[in-house]
Amino acid sequence: GPVQSKSPRFASWDEMNVLAHGLLQLGQGLREHAERTRSQLSALERRLSACGSACQGTEGSTDLPLAPESRVDPEVLHSLQTQLKAQNSRIQQLFHKVAQQQRHLEKQHLRIQHLQSQFGLLDHKHLDHEVAKPARRKRLPEMAQPVDPAHNVSRLHRLPRDCQELFQVGERQSGLFEIQPQGSPPFLVNCKMTSDGGWTVIQRRHDGSVDFNRPWEAYKAGFGDPHGEFWLGLEKVHSITGDRNSRLAVQLRDWDGNAELLQFSVHLGGEDTAYSLQLTAPVAGQLGATTVPPSGLSVPFSTWDQDHDLRRDKNCAKSLSGGWWFGTCSHSNLNGQYFRSIPQQRQKLKKGIFWKTWRGRYYPLQATTMLIQPMAAEAAS
C-alpha cells in the first residue's frame, strides 16, 4: 500500500534523451532510405528513357537493372515504365510519410527539451509514504501540478478509465488528467503516481477556500476546483471503483507540519446504498481499529438534507458540518468546517475537520487529502 518510503523509479533525462535521439535517428534513417530508393528508381527511369525504342529483344525479361545492349519489346518497355511510375509514386508516398514522421519526432524532441528546461521547477511527484511521527515534524508534500504531463493516453485509443490505468500505460507524472470510467462522461482528476501505481484524489482541503457544508446533490455531483480544494463527487468516485474493492488512502496534516497517512481496504456502494462505505480489511497504519467503525460494517453517506447516519437521536451532518460517512458523529469528519485558528467555543469546534484517533476530537486539521485506487476485478466481494 502507499505506506512505504521507497520512491518509484523515473526514467532519467539522459535515458529520455537517448530514446529521443534514437527516434530521431530512426526517422532520419528511414528518410535517407526513401531518398536513396527514390534516386535509384529515378536513375533507372532515366536509363530506360534514354534507351527508348533502340532497346529491343529478350522478351518478357524483367530483371533489373537492364543492360543497355538488351533488346526489349516496346510493349514490355511500356509496361516496365508503368510499373516504375507506380513504384515511384509508392516511394513518394513513403517519403512523405517518413517526412511527416520526422516532423512529428522533431516536435517530440522539442517537447522533451521544453520539459527538460522546466524539470527544475517540479518537486517530487510521488507520495512520501513514510508515516510521520509528531516529533519529526515532517511535512507532507502538496499535490504537484503538472508542467506538461507526457500523456500516454494515445496508447489506449480512448481516455483512461482511472489513474491506475494511466499508470499501467506508462504515465509516471502526477497531475491533472482526463479520465472516462465505463458508462460515464469524461472528467478531470488529480492523479498521484506512486511506486504503488496511480491513485485518484477524491478530496483535498488546505486553505478553507471552498465551502464544504453542502447538500446531498452537491456531494453526489462534486464541487470545488481541481487546482485547489474539492470534493470529486460520490457518483464520480463510484464510477471509478464500480463494484470492485478499493484502497483508500487518507493523508492528514496538523498545524505544526506533522503528517499521518492511513490506508484502508474499502468497498463503495452506489446511490441505492447511499454510497455506503464498507471496510473490507483492517486499517493499515498505527491508529488501530478505533479509527472507524468495525471492519465489515457498512456506513452510508450523510448530508444535512439526507440523514443516513447510524444515530437515531441526531442528524450528524446538521449538528456538525459537511457531508461524511457518519457513524456516531464522533469518529471523523474530513469535510467539516475549516478553521484557521482554534475557536474558543466547543460547540463551534466540534464542527471542524477532525480525525479523533490522531489529533483528537477537537483538533481542527490544517490539510487533508483522500485518494482511491481500485483493486483488480477479481478482488471484488
Epitope: Q145, P146, V147, D148, P149, H151, V153, L159, G175, L176, F177, E178, P185, P186, F187, L188, E217, A218, A221, G222, F223, G224, D225, P226, H227, F230, W231, L232, G233, K236
Partner: antibody, heavy 120, light 107 residues
C-alpha cells in the same frame, strides 16, 4: 493575469476552411480546458467545442463534422479549424479558458474576439 | 441538449432601480449555472458562478440565486456602467449552452 489573443484571417471564402489560433499568456495552458465560442452579429453565444492539454476534444454536435481543434503546449496556444464555411458562419469568434470545477465548469477568461466574415 | 430560456429579452431601467433577470433550464442542472455580462464591442465577463457565487472583482450589487431549473440574476441599485447584455450559461452537461441574452438599457 491570464490573457487570450485570437488571430487569423478576417475574411474567408465560402466552402473554404476558417483557421484561428489563440495564444495564451500569463499562465500555463496545462490543466485547463480551452474553448471556442462564437457570436453572430446581434445574436447570442454558441459554444463550438473544447480541447484539453492532452489533445482530447469535445465538439458541439451541431458543428462536429466540420470542426477540428488542436493544441500546442510548447507554444502555449490552441487552434480552431472550421471547414466548408458558409455565410452562416460569419461571426465574432472568441477563445476562452474553461475552468474545471466539479460543480460545473465556467469560462473565467475570454479573448477580445475576432470577426470572421465568410464572403466571396 | 439543455435549452436555457432567459426573460425578459429587453429591459429599460432607471439608475438605482433593482433589476431581475430569470433563466429557466429545460431540465434540472443543479447549480451548474453561470452569469456573464457583455458590454457593446467587448467580450463577455464572468459575474456569477454556480448560481450564487460572485466571481472575484465583481461588485456586490450583483447577486445570483436558484437551483435545479429556475435561476435569477439580481442587480441591486443599477448603475449607468451596468448597461449591457446578460447571458446565463449551463455546464451541467455538454454541449455548453447559453440563454438568448437580456439587454439592459439605462433610461
Amino acid at each position: 493575469q491570464v490573457q487570450l489573443q485570437e488571430s487569423g484571417p478576417g475574411l474567408v471564402k465560402p466552402s473554404e476552411t476558417l483557421s484561428l489560433t489563440c495564444i495564451v499568456s500569463g499562465d500555463s495552458i496545462s490543466g485547463y480546458y480551452w474553448s471556442w465560442i462564437r457570436q453572430p452579429a446581434g445574436k447570442g453565444l454558441e459554444w463550438i467545442g473544447r480541447i484539453y492539454t492532452s489533445g482530447n476534444t469535445i465538439y458541439n454536435p451541431s458543428l462536429k463534422s466540420r470542426v477540428t481543434m488542436s493544441v500546442d503546449t510548447s507554444k502555449n496556444q490552441f487552434s480552431l479549424k472550421l471547414s466548408s464555411v458558409t455565410a452562416a458562419d460569419t461571426a465574432v469568434y472568441y477563445c476562452a479558458r474553461e475552468r474545471p470545477d466539479y460543480g460545473g465548469n465556467f469560462f473565467d477568461y475570454w479573448g477580445q474576439g475576432t470577426l470572421v466574415t465568410v464572403s466571396s | 441538449e439543455i435549452v436555457l430560456t432567459q426573460s425578459p429579452d429587453f429591459q429599460s431601467v432607471t439608475p438605482k432601480e433593482k433589476v431581475t433577470i430569470t433563466c429557466r433550464a429545460s431540465q434540472s442542472i443543479g447549480s451548474s449555472l453561470h452569469w456573464y455580462q457583455q458590454k457593446p464591442d467587448q467580450s463577455p465577463k464572468l459575474l456569477i458562478k454556480h448560481a450564487s457565487q460572485s466571481f472575484s472583482g465583481v461588485p456586490s450589487r450583483f447577486s445570483g440565486s436558484g437551483s435545479g431549473t429556475d435561476f435569477t440574476l439580481t442587480i441591486n441599485s443599477l448603475e449607468a456602467e451596468d448597461a449591457a447584455t446578460y447571458y446565463c450559461h449551463q455546464s451541467s452537461s455538454l454541449p455548453h449552452t447559453f440563454g438568448g441574452g437580456t439587454k439592459v438599457e439605462i433610461k
